[in-house]
């Protein structure tokens, strides 16, 4: 039975040209995390593997930085970066847990972070 929950940074907003950290945290399970995938809609941004380290997709290498931790940093944001981001935790023996973050990139200087929320 999958008992874990993923806590994410939730709905967040950031200014165009700025940067943002996408962060997820898996809790309430003793399952071993073997890999974390970061995806934007259907595009793979990055993989962090327990044994093999980081792999950033070549098309995102200039604007995506690994970390902190298992998180991902998006840089030089554009309005096209607005949308859903997913952290996909591959675990043993539980299987896959997915967290969702919605990022809105704003033209204005008023960009406030939303509240944290959980996805079972």
């Amino acid at each position: 039975m999958m008992t874990g929950t993923i806590e994410t940074t939730g709905n967040i907003s950031a200014e165009k040209g700025g940067s943002i950290i996408l962060q997820c945290h898996l809790s309430s399970t003793t399952a071993q995390v073997t890999q974390v995938n970061w995806e934007q809609q259907d595009q793979l941004l990055a993989i962090c593997n327990a044994d093999l380290g980081w792999h950033i997709s070549p098309s995102f290498k200039d604007r995506v930085a690994p970390g902190p931790g298992l998180g991902l940093t998006l840089q030089s944001l554009t309005v096209n970066d607005t949308g859903e981001y997913f952290c996909i935790y591959h675990t043993y023996p539980d299987g896959t847990y997915t967290g969702r973050i919605f990022l809105e990139v704003l033209e204005s200087s008023v960009a406030e972070h939303g509240a944290r929320f959980q996805i079972p």
């Epitope: 995390v33 327990a50 044994d51 093999l52 380290g53 980081w54 930085a65 690994p66 298992l70």
Partner: antibody, heavy 119, light 107 residues
Framework: EFQLQQSGPELVKPGASVKISCRAS????????INWVQQTNGKSLEWIGV????????NYNQKFKGKATLTVDQSSSAAYMQLNSLTSEDSAVYFC????????????WGTGTTVTVSS | DIQMTQSPASLSASVGETVTITCRAG??????LAWYQQKQGKSPQLLVY???TLPEGVPSRFSGSGSGTQFSLKINSLQSEDFGSYYC?????????FGGGTKLEIK
């Protein structure tokens, strides 16, 4: 104390194979992956590959694919590396070294095994 | 593969001196860099990881710094047991690669 004890020196003929061992003690063998590293002439170090004792997953450095074969035996907390079709270029010291989950540096190293390939 | 370039290749210093070894990565490796010390005929030992973190038991005279592509290892007030070879290694993504090493000798 965490230890990785490796098998003794090997003198082998060109074209032959050799299998060297790395026995872990003082920690949970399946909690850390085992890497193998080559050191030629006391000079620099080259990563050969990594094996995860818990899942049996293996990743090789492209350069050593076909040359090295990594295995583990959970029951005896041992990792093994077989080197095939040996040439004088494979004469080196071989180290095993462990790394933790999402920690890709080597915090404990084996004692080293010297392999000499000579006719 | 990410190329790691260490300098100098060799270095002579006296007990009590401060020395700095540098390591350059062929591409951005952020802070994913480790340093190892190896004495003649022995196995390497971890000195620094994540560019600046010292494992338990490593003397505070060792310090690591840098990020991106430029890194350094500084040894303050050299002790006789510090002489040997030093290697950097990136731990960003496989294949892990090492620098060519720096041999630190007693002057």
């Amino acid at each position: 104390e965490f230890q990785l004890q490796q098998s003794g020196p090997e003198l082998v003929k060109p074209g032959a194979s050799v299998k060297i061992s790395c026995r872990a003690s003082g920690y949970s063998f399946t909690a850390y992956s085992i890497n193998w590293v080559q050191q030629t002439n006391g000079k620099s170090l080259e990563w050969i590959g990594v094996i995860n004792p818990k899942f049996g997953t293996i990743n090789y450095n492209q350069k050593f694919k076909g040359k090295a074969t990594l295995t583990v035996d959970q029951s005896s907390s041992a990792a093994y590396m077989q080197l095939n079709s040996l040439t004088s270029e494979d004469s080196a010291v071989y180290f095993c070294a462990r790394n933790g989950n999402f920690a890709w540096y080597f915090d404990v190293w084996g004692t080293g095994t010297t392999v000499t390939v000579s006719s | 593969d990410i190329q790691m370039t260490q300098s100098p290749a060799s270095l002579s210093a006296s007990v009590g001196e401060t020395v700095t070894i540098t390591c350059r990565a062929g591409e951005n490796i952020y802070s994913y860099l480790a340093w190892y010390q190896q004495k003649q005929g022995k196995s390497p030992q971890l000195l620094v990881y994540n560019a600046k973190t010292l494992p338990e038991g490593v003397p505070s005279r060792f310090s690591g710094s840098g990020s991106g592509t430029q890194f350094s290892l500084k040894i303050n007030s050299l002790q006789s047991e510090d002489f040997g070879s030093y290697y950097c290694q990136h731990h960003y993504g496989v294949p892990w690669t090492f620098g060519g090493g720096t041999k630190l000798e007693i002057k």
